[in-house]
Amino acid sequence: MKVLQEPTCVSDYMSISTCEWKMGGPTNCSAELRLLYQLVFQSSETHTCVPENNGGVGCVCHLLMDDVVSMDNYTLDLWAGQQLLWKGSFKPSEHVKPRAPGNLTVHTNVSDTVLLTWSNPYPPDNYLYNDLTYAVNIWSENDPAYSRIHNVTYLKPTLRIPASTLKSGISYRARVRAWAQHYNTTWSEWSPSTKWYNSYREPFEQ
């Protein structure tokens, strides 16, 4: 039994790091393999992750990590019974994929503005909480040519769009994703999209 593609890991910088790898042949990951991980830190303990199958030769493991901070470094040991298949290390802060924002809501009751709000996916005491910026994607299923990305570089998870910039009488969808500038993260997954109908009409000019 051997590793074909070494484990690569990403962290949500909160509680979970996900490691994926490929084996040299079909493998029952949960029955045959164990990924042991330990924080390189005083009085830390070794933890065991039971991997799941991810396709025929692929395995994935979700490592539970508490209080993730920038200096953290983990040793990783992939075992098949008594055989050490691979040994490596993982620094979560250098491989961050933020959690997706949640609770995306569209407020259309503000006279001439479409207000989008969503929730920061991290609690206030998490180090990413004040570092997230967002991208909001708005598109229309009625108008396939219309798709816009709005970059939200301020901290407040809101976006205001003049309703007049959208076509009246058609439906729009929006979704949002996040990244953290100071941690040089990848983008999060997109949030679930939300749909609304733009009923705004320009005031009649005399």
């Epitope: 830390s44 508490d66 901070v69």
Partner: antibody, heavy 116, light 111 residues
């Protein structure tokens, strides 16, 4: 919100032991390391050791090896620091502090006075 | 015994800027991240800066940190009377064993 509530002030005689408690609330107790540090009157901060509340494993500063014992009780979310063979120079405010490489939450401190 | 050296005291008038230095060596600041703590009279220390230059939630941007080589600096702009306190730098030392260490402390007086 995170709170670390420490036990009250103590007056001890030289040679005695003192046990200071630090009760945690507002977070998952076993998910965060706890440090102990002390500060003698008018002096700076001195690290004493660390405990991992998850498994109870500890690491102590060389200076306090053999004299300090850190324990935890997960049922009450409390960590303890016991210092034995007290001497006058152990008179200090003792702090528990949550974190790993830096400490974001601190208890208010417990004054331990060692005097004959 | 602290191996991080800070000036014993600094002072400046309200509204001014002040910097506090923290000098170490290759086995500590040179090889680790620096944090800064503020200790108001009669209270526990409070984290101001971590990772050399990051601020926890709730710390105003008047406080900033930087690191260069084996030294670190805390800068406070727009000084307020409420900033009068002791300030400590902290980091990890790897010699002879891994351990957290603190600076000697700096008393900031707002004139």
């Amino acid at each position: 919100q995170v709170q670390l509530v420490q036990s009250g002030a103590e007056v001890k005689k030289p040679g005695a032991s003192v046990k200071v408690s630090c009760k945690a609330s507002g977070y998952a107790f076993t998910s965060y390391y706890m440090h102990w540090a002390r500060q003698a009157p008018g002096q700076g901060l001195e690290w004493m050791g660390i405990i991992n509340p998850s498994g109870g494993s500890t690491s102590y500063a060389q200076k306090f090896q053999g004299r300090v014992t850190m324990t935890r009780d997960t049922s009450t979310s409390t960590v303890y620091m016991e210092l034995s063979s007290l001497r006058s120079e152990d008179t200090a405010v003792y702090y528990c502090a949550r974190g790993k490489w830096w400490w974001q939450h601190w208890g208010k401190g417990t004054l331990v006075t060692v005097s004959s | 015994q602290s191996v991080l050296t800070q000036p014993p005291s600094v002072s400046a008038a309200p509204g001014q800027k002040v910097t506090i230095s923290c000098s170490g060596g290759s086995s500590n600041i040179g090889n680790s991240y620096v944090s800064w703590y503020q200790q108001l009279p009669g209270t526990a220390p409070k984290l101001l800066i971590y990772d050399n230059n990051k601020r926890p939630s709730g710390i105003p941007d008047r406080f900033s940190g930087s690191k260069s080589g084996t030294s670190a600096t805390l800068a406070i702009t727009g000084l307020q009377t409420g900033d009068e306190a002791d300030y400590y730098c902290g980091t990890w030392d790897t010699s002879p064993v891994d351990r957290p260490i603190f600076g000697t402390g700096t008393k900031l007086t707002v004139l």
